[in-house]
């Protein structure tokens, strides 16, 4: 008789999840010599231990602490790039500007990027059929709690000028319900962070509006200012040219506004 299994609203665990995490861990240590002390088998065990045999709606930050410890990493605190709803461009940017880091440029972010995972209460099985959806099922699911935990730690580590890339094509350029809006903004440390600089990325070629005047950006400025952190904002009118100029800053066309 097949065992009854909870049906969740979200997609199930990414196929070959354990192998993917292990392979990514090894790949990361290959690229980043400073992380070669990392024991990828222990990393997988700690990752697995955070959600296996636990109810996937009852995961806590505490469950991830062994993994957090194994993945402890020092990134230059003044070279942090946060992003919201514009991951691909943020990653393209840090691939060119190698001294800046998104969360997914750290070991733990790299391991979990674009993956889904969950287990089942009281069994050692990984659920490949379905996992809880943040809205439709529960917020304390393995994936959401993981990103909340690593995002909080990443924001807490930031100092000096912190940059955030925001998607100017969205109806809410700054969304209080995003990970940036609900976690990272509130965990920047005013005693360490002097300024949050927002880069609003324009979508349309002919879009010459000053999106720094958008009401949601003003809301972000208000939240940040109340936390005793300065705020500044820049429009990135042409993201393609922006990336090109990061690659080749000497290019004569890069002196004009991008």
């Amino acid at each position: 008789v097949p065992r009854w299994r909870q049906q969740w609203s979200g997609p199930g665990t990414t196929k070959r999840f354990p192998e993917t995490v292990l392979a990514r861990c090894v790949k990361y240590t290959e690229i980043h010599p400073e992380m070669r002390h990392v024991d990828c088998q222990s990393v997988w065990d700690a990752f697995k231990g955070a959600f296996i045999s636990k109810h996937p709606c009852n995961i806590t930050e505490e469950d991830y602490q062994p993994l957090m410890k194994l993945g402890t990493q020092t990134v230059p605190c003044n070279k942090i790039l946060l992003w919201s709803r514009i991951k691909d461009l943020a990653h393209q940017f840090t691939q060119v500007q190698r001294d800046m880091f998104t969360l997914e440029d750290t070991l733990l972010g790299y391991l979990a990027d674009d993956l889904t995972w969950c287990g089942e209460f009281n069994t050692s099985k990984i659920n490949y059929q379905s996992c809880p959806d943040w809205r439709k099922d529960c917020s304390n699911n393995p994936v959401s709690v993981f990103w909340k935990t690593v995002s909080r730690r990443f924001a807490e580590a930031a100092c000096d000028v912190v940059h955030v890339m925001l998607n100017g094509s969205r109806s809410k350029i700054f969304d209080k319900n995003s990970t940036f809006g609900s976690v990272e903004v509130h965990n920047l440390q005013p005693e360490k962070v002097q300024t949050l600089e927002a880069w609003v990325i324009h979508g349309g070629r002919e879009d010459s509006r000053d999106l720094c005047q958008d009401p949601t950006i003003k809301e972000l400025e208000s939240i940040i200012s109340k936390r005793n952190i300065q705020f500044s904002c820049k429009n990135i009118y042409r993201p393609d040219k922006f990336l090109q100029c990061v690659k080749n800053p000497e290019d004569s066309s890069c002196t004009s506004e991008i």
Epitope: E30, P33, R36, D39, Q41, S42, D45, A46
Partner: antibody, heavy 121, light 107 residues
Framework: QVTLKESGPTLVKPTQTLTLTCTFS??????????VGWIRQPPGKALEWLAH???????RYNPALKSRLTITKDTSKNQVVLTMTNMDPVDTATYYC?????????????WGQGTLVTVSS | DIQMTQSPSSLSASVGDRVTITCRAS??????VAWFQQKPGKAPKLLIY???YRYTGVPSRFSGSGSGTDFTLTISSLQPEDFATYYC?????????FGQGTKVEIK
Amino acid sequence: QVTLKESGPTLVKPTQTLTLTCTFSGLSLSTSGKGVGWIRQPPGKALEWLAHIWWDDDKRYNPALKSRLTITKDTSKNQVVLTMTNMDPVDTATYYCARIELGRSYVMDYWGQGTLVTVSS
Amino acid sequence: DIQMTQSPSSLSASVGDRVTITCRASQDVITSVAWFQQKPGKAPKLLIYSASYRYTGVPSRFSGSGSGTDFTLTISSLQPEDFATYYCQQHYTIPLTFGQGTKVEIK
């Protein structure tokens, strides 16, 4: 099959520099993810990790001995060389080289047979 | 540096006995502990890594467990070829450090 073999002097005088060579087969340090480390063991005592080197020339040393140690590799000869300056009788030990592999952090899975180095005047 | 303390330093046992060796780390090393077997005049042989993973070719009578600071190597049924010295090693951080060894002798 991976094999490693240590070679070098069996006797060195105090204050001299020790040069040890690890020659290996079935392993290439031009292959991503591979490394070779050195460990020593004084007679009747425990093991002590000294240093290791990765395929991309990334090196790590035991901080307590760092000022005296240099590790290098010659990929074409399949060799790793450890030099240790200012030898002292307390450095008398069997010196081993061993393989390390990325992802298992610093787990040494294949070891050489070891070479006994005596420091005495 | 992380100190690795093994106990006992030596033990006497008979063939067929269940033998347990413990290792305590001076700080949390999660599960980054390896165990080695060494016979006189020979190089150490890897038995267990990452606390509980048996290395290729190691007999199933050898098992490892533990996490955090306390780790155990168990030989479920001691064989004549198992009389040797056993070392634990933390592979969590540099400098890599070893325990002082546990000598398993014939009773």
